[in-house]
């Protein structure tokens, strides 16, 4: 399981406000089990995007069907993008646990840019 | 955490219905496939399907397929199984089981639900 | 289908000595890199305890005494030092296809 590695493809990302950003992620592994999470920004700050396990984030969907066998695809888009949504995002695979999951290993990162709305 | 409660014990007349339930909490319900499995007194453990709720997709155990039907509610994030026309060798405790990896396991349990079949 | 045969069906083992399941399968389970396999743990009155998945991978919480081995079609679970608290049934589940369950092994102290 240590061979296990999450890659973020794109070190940037750009995307005109108003439309959706796709940040793309996925792992190399189906072991550890454990949910994948996406954060924006690193260290204690770091805001949650979105929690595969469980929350409600009505602006993130997933790219693949995460309960589907052998996937291994955590894409995220996420929809009606502002400026404030600019900044740097990690996808972060976590390890099953008990009570709680363990954060496991991180992707490089993403970092999304943001344009003004076209006129 | 990851909590599954069943519905409580059920005494049936050979020929008749049951439904047991199990309502899913510490998780987002569609995420993750949910199991059926039963265990007759003293015997081991039989699959009988797995449904994912977020898209109802279901697959049976033949044995079963002509007598039991999975649906979940995803409002009250509640998974339930029928088992229709029992007869006494369906005495058993009826189990679900959240998979947690997509590995078609079964990672958390339900405490069971005992059903009876007896004239 | 897919049939898995574990033996013995019953294991008597002193404290602290090593105990050994094994499971076999009809045919290989293994696909896209991994072995389909799962062991559990089913003490009496209780659910079933997810022990090892994907043949070799402990579950969370799961001792280090316990351990799974095997490729293809042959499994085994190995406690290396057996504890009081290890007294239950054993069973294994494949998921190459639809899931299905060895008939179990009752591990007893001697």
């Known amino acids: 399981e240590e061979g296990l590695q999450v890659i973020q493809p794109d070190k940037s990302v750009s995307v005109a406000a108003g439309e959706s950003a796709i940040l793309h992620c996925t792992a190399t592994s189906l072991i550890p089990v454990g949910p994948i999470q996406w954060f924006r920004g690193a260290g204690p700050g770091r805001e949650l995007i979105y929690n595969q396990k469980e929350g409600h984030f009505p602006r993130v969907t997933t790219v693949s069907d995460l309960t589907k066998r052998n996937n291994m695809d955590f894409s995220i888009r996420i929809g009606n993008i502002t400026p404030a949504d600019a900044g740097t995002y990690y996808c972060v695979k976590f390890r099953k646990g008990s009570p709680d999951d363990v954060e496991f290993k991180s992707g490089a990162g993403t970092e999304l840019s943001v344009r003004a709305k076209p006129s | 955490q990851v909590q599954l409660v069943q519905s409580g014990a059920e005494v049936k007349k050979p020929g008749a219905s049951v439904k047991v339930s199990c309502k899913a909490s510490g998780y987002t319900f569609t995420n993750y496939w949910i199991n059926w499995v039963r265990q007759a007194p003293g015997q081991g453990l039989e699959w009988i399907a797995m449904?994912?709720?977020?898209?109802?997709?279901?697959h049976y155990n033949q044995i079963f397929k002509d007598r039991a039907t999975l649906t979940t509610d995803t409002s009250t994030s509640t998974a339930y199984m029928e088992l229709r026309s029992l007869r006494s060798d369906d005495t058993a405790v009826y189990y679900c089981a959240m998979d947690y990896g997509s590995l078609y396991a079964m990672d958390y349990w339900g405490r069971g639900t005992l059903v009876t079949v007896s004239s | 289908d897919i049939v898995l045969t574990q033996s013995p069906d019953s294991l008597a083992v002193s404290l602290g000595e090593r105990a050994t399941i094994n499971c076999r399968a009809s045919q290989s389970v293994r696909s896209s890199g991994y072995n389909w396999i799962f062991w559990y743990q089913q003490k009496p009155g209780q659910p079933p305890k997810l022990l090892i998945y994907l043949a070799s991978n402990r579950d969370s919480g799961v001792p280090d005494r316990f351990s799974g081995s095997g490729s293809g079609t042959d499994f085994t679970l190995t406690i290396s030092s057996l504890q009081a608290e290890d007294v239950a049934v054993y069973y294994c589940q494949h998921s190459r296809e639809l899931p299905t369950f060895g008939q179990g092994t009752k591990l007893e102290i001697k």
């Open positions: 449904i994912d709720p977020s898209d109802s997709e279901t």
